[in-house]
């Protein structure tokens, strides 16, 4: 076959060659969150900036209403960082009061919604107990990994408590994906 | 062009096909930091090992004096981990003395300097309050994301306190970038 | 010097073109760990799920007995997250008892074993002191970077204490690699 002449002998080319600059890609950055209704026992989804500053979507990767829309099947690297900040967690207050010491926690989940499966799939989770001594605390949770996605899949970032998300700077809280 | 004949109809190839092994890439590892003058209100930049051990630069991605130099415009994945270590933070001392409890913090920033914008751009920031009970503490901050960079851009890693950086092992503190 | 401008000669193809969908890739997810013998002063290696749920291996990237096997030389992005959880660390108990305050710690290491070198190489390490106030704590350590690997190299993830690894969910603890 023409086009396979460059392939090293140990490897057959089954997939079309394609220019890297043409692959779906997105990097989304934090915006101030407007309180939205979310269902009980379901973490709220963050919404994002998709075109100002460092944010962009390209090559048919689109962002709409909290979701990154996957335009083409393939293996994607997906990542997010959420920076949380808060006042002293109840944990230490409870501790001082001698009550059971269940720590507070902060959690980030990257979730896939797909037509071919009725329930959302949790792709990545970062979860951390927060039991800080200081009166003000802040810390990031970073996630990133590769997943096989289908055209039409939707990705979102859910957090345990939207009010603790640091939305002040685009470099602190972000979400991205690119086709490998 | 030969090699483009397999392209699926939904996708025009606007960019030239190029061999993956020819793309600019670098992985830099920590070295002992020599105290350098840095200007007020500016976090100091780390310098790096670029050729010994696990470190390398290739395909026109060069390292010089704290900077990774971007040789070609495109979308890059950029990452860094900095491991910090220190003695008990002042935070807990302040707390014990009954004074206002402003926590210490550790911060990593990946910064872009570009000639198309007059001030450095903070691409990624990881910042964490440190208010440890233990007498010695250590922890990493990891960052990674994709950005559109221009030929001639320069990347550096800045930290809030260079004296807290663990420079003892190349696998603990590192900085890298590769063209997607 | 004029000759120091970036020449547009970067569009020459020096290496064979190859289809992206044909590259070695794997994403492995946590399973319950069976206690295994490990040598003194050597962190135990995790074993992984490689085909159920979110896990997969493809294009000659194979998983066997705790190791990812690298089928082709090149530059790989390697990543892992391990979520740890435990009861109050001894650190705070020791502190309360007035004994020397050496903090407990949690550590993840991504290790390469290669035929061409007698000792394993630590590629990435994430290590964190754990000195929690709360009675139950949990937190992730994330690592990711690019390395030049040789055909036949083997990758594994080692942890400081296998009993602290959260094996309950595939999105909390994972390990992956892909050829760039």
């Amino acid at each position: 076959l023409k086009g396979q002449e460059f392939a090293p002998s140990h490897q057959q080319v089954y997939a079309p060659l394609r220019a890297d600059g043409d692959k779906p890609r997105a990097h989304l950055t934090v915006v101030r969150q407007t309180p939205t209704q979310h269902f009980k026992n379901q973490f709220p989804a963050l919404h994002w900036e998709h075109e100002l500053g460092l944010a962009f979507t390209k090559n048919r990767m689109n962002y709409t209403n909290k979701f990154l829309l996957i335009p083409e099947s393939g293996d994607y690297f997906i990542y997010s960082q959420v920076t949380f900040r808060g006042m002293t967690s109840e944990c230490s207050e409870i501790r001082q009061a001698g009550r059971p010491n269940k720590p507070d926690s902060i959690t980030v989940v990257i979730t896939k919604v797909t037509d071919s499966y009725p329930e959302p799939t949790q792709l990545l989770m970062g979860t951390k107990s927060v039991c800080e001594v200081g009166s003000n605390w802040f810390q990031p949770i970073y996630l990133g990994a590769m997943f096989s996605l289908q055209e039409g899949d939707k990705l979102m970032v859910n957090v345990s408590d939207i009010s603790l998300v640091d939305y002040t700077k685009e470099d602190k809280t972000f979400f991205g994906a690119f086709l490998l | 062009l030969k090699g483009q004949e397999f392209a699926p109809s939904h996708q025009q190839v606007y960019a030239p096909l190029r061999a993956d092994g020819d793309k600019p890439r670098a992985h830099l590892t920590v070295v002992r930091q020599t105290p350098t003058q840095h200007f007020k209100n500016q976090f100091p930049a780390l310098h790096w090992e670029h050729e010994l051990g696990l470190a390398f630069t290739k395909n026109r991605m060069n390292y010089t004096n704290k900077f990774l130099l971007i040789p070609e415009s495109g979308d890059y994945f950029i990452y860094s981990q900095v491991t910090f270590r220190g003695m008990t933070s002042e935070c807990s001392e302040i707390r014990q003395a009954g004074r206002p409890n402003k926590p210490d913090s550790i911060t990593v920033v990946i910064t872009k300097v570009t000639d198309s914008y007059p001030e450095p751009t903070q691409l990624l920031m990881g910042t964490k309050s440190v208010c440890e009970v233990g007498s010695n503490w250590f922890q990493p901050i990891y960052l990674g994301a994709m950005f559109s960079l221009q030929e001639g851009d320069k990347l550096m890693v800045n930290v809030s306190d260079i004296s807290l950086v663990d420079y003892t092992k190349e696998d603990k503190t590192f900085f890298g970038a590769f063209l997607l | 010097l004029k000759g120091q401008e970036f020449a547009p000669s970067h569009q020459q193809v020096y290496a064979p073109l190859r289809a992206d969908g044909d590259k070695p890739r794997a994403h492995l997810t946590v399973v319950r760990q069976t206690p295994t013998q490990h040598f003194k002063n050597q962190f135990p290696a995790l074993h992984w799920e490689h085909e159920l749920g979110l896990a997969f291996t493809k294009n000659r990237m194979n998983y066997t007995n705790k190791f990812l096997l690298i089928p082709e030389s090149g530059d790989y992005f390697i990543y892992s997250q391990v979520t740890f959880r435990g009861m109050t660390s001894e650190c705070s108990e020791i502190r309360q008892a007035g004994r020397p305050n050496k903090p407990d710690s949690i550590t993840v290491v991504i290790t390469k074993v290669t035929d061409s070198y007698p000792e394993p190489t630590q590629l990435l390490m994430g290590t964190k002191s754990v000195c929690e106030v709360g009675s139950n704590w949990f937190q992730p350590i994330y690592l990711g970077a690019m390395f030049s690997l040789q055909e036949g190299d083997k990758l594994m993830v080692n942890v400081s204490d296998i009993s602290l690894v959260d094996y309950t969910k595939e999105d909390k603890t994972f390990f992956g690699a892909f050829l760039l």
Epitope: - | Q37, H38, F39, A45, N62, T64, N65, K66, F67, L69, V113, T114, D115, S116, Y117, P118, E119, P120, G152, K154 | L1, K2, Q4, E5, F6
Partner: antibody, heavy 116, light 106 residues
Framework: QVQLQESGPGLVRPSQTLSLTCTVS????????MHWVRQRPGRGLEWMGR????????KYNPSLKSRVTITRDTSKNQVSLRLSSVTAADTAVYYC?????????WGQGSLVTVSS | DIQMTQSPSSLSASVGDRVTITCRAS?????MYWYQQKPGKAPKLLIY???NLASGVPSRFSGSGSGTDFTFTISSLQPEDIATYYC?????????FGQGTKVEIK
């Protein structure tokens, strides 16, 4: 305090090479980019080119590229401009400019007259 | 080259007046810069990234716009604002300036 100081001969003969040096202080030379901009009498501003002191990489205005060379000496914190084959049309105030770190800083300018 | 067309080339206004200068790029640019140059002096950066005020610049100066059309405004002209104002784009090679707008007091 950030300072840029241009220096060089104020008079250059036609067909000769104009040479100017910019000495910088008060900031980390490598952290920025250094440009040369000129302003001919009664005219607007014209960007000539820039150098990245960290790498030595340069970019030039295509209209001047065949005649202009910008170099740097990091040990002296200096950037130099050379413009060859000058004519009377090259008579101008030449400015050295820092970019990449706010504030954007300009030297006070150096008037160069091309005349026989 | 990206051509920068600045208008007007000169204007005369009274102290306290609102003054507006426009700059049109021949193709879209992400960032626009505005400089002030007083006679015999080097240009001084006033606005960067289309709308960010440089340090130490009075708040009566502002910038706006995106793509190809940008505006520079002095909300209340002061006697010390007598100068020539230039727009500049940094993205194309070469960097190009507008031809300048000379601002005078009536």
């Amino acid at each position: 305090q950030v300072q840029l100081q241009e220096s060089g001969p104020g008079l250059v003969r036609p067909s000769q090479t104009l040479s100017l040096t910019c000495t910088v202080s008060g900031f980390d030379f490598d952290d920025t980019y250094m440009h040369w901009v000129r302003q001919r009498p009664g005219r607007g501003l014209e960007w000539m080119g820039r150098i990245d002191p960290a790498s030595g990489h340069t970019k030039y205005n295509p209209s001047l590229k065949s005649r202009v060379t910008i170099t740097r000496d990091t040990s002296k914190n200096q950037v130099s401009l050379r413009l060859s084959s000058v004519t009377a049309a090259d008579t101008a105030v030449y400015y050295c400019v820092r970019s990449g770190g706010l504030p954007d800083v300009w030297g006070q300018g150096s008037l160069v007259t091309v005349s026989s | 080259d990206i051509q920068m067309t600045q208008s007007p080339s000169s204007l005369s206004a009274s102290v306290g007046d609102r003054v507006t200068i426009t700059c049109r790029a021949s193709q879209g640019v992400e960032y626009m810069y505005w400089y002030q140059q007083k006679p015999g002096k080097a240009p001084k950066l006033l606005i960067y990234g289309a709308s960010n005020l440089a340090s130490g610049v009075p708040s009566r100066f502002s910038g706006s716009g995106s793509g190809t059309d940008f505006t520079f405004t002095i909300s209340s002209l002061q006697p010390e604002d007598i100068a020539t104002y230039y727009c500049q784009q940094w993205e194309g090679n070469p960097r190009t300036f507008g031809q300048g707008t000379k601002v005078e007091i009536k």
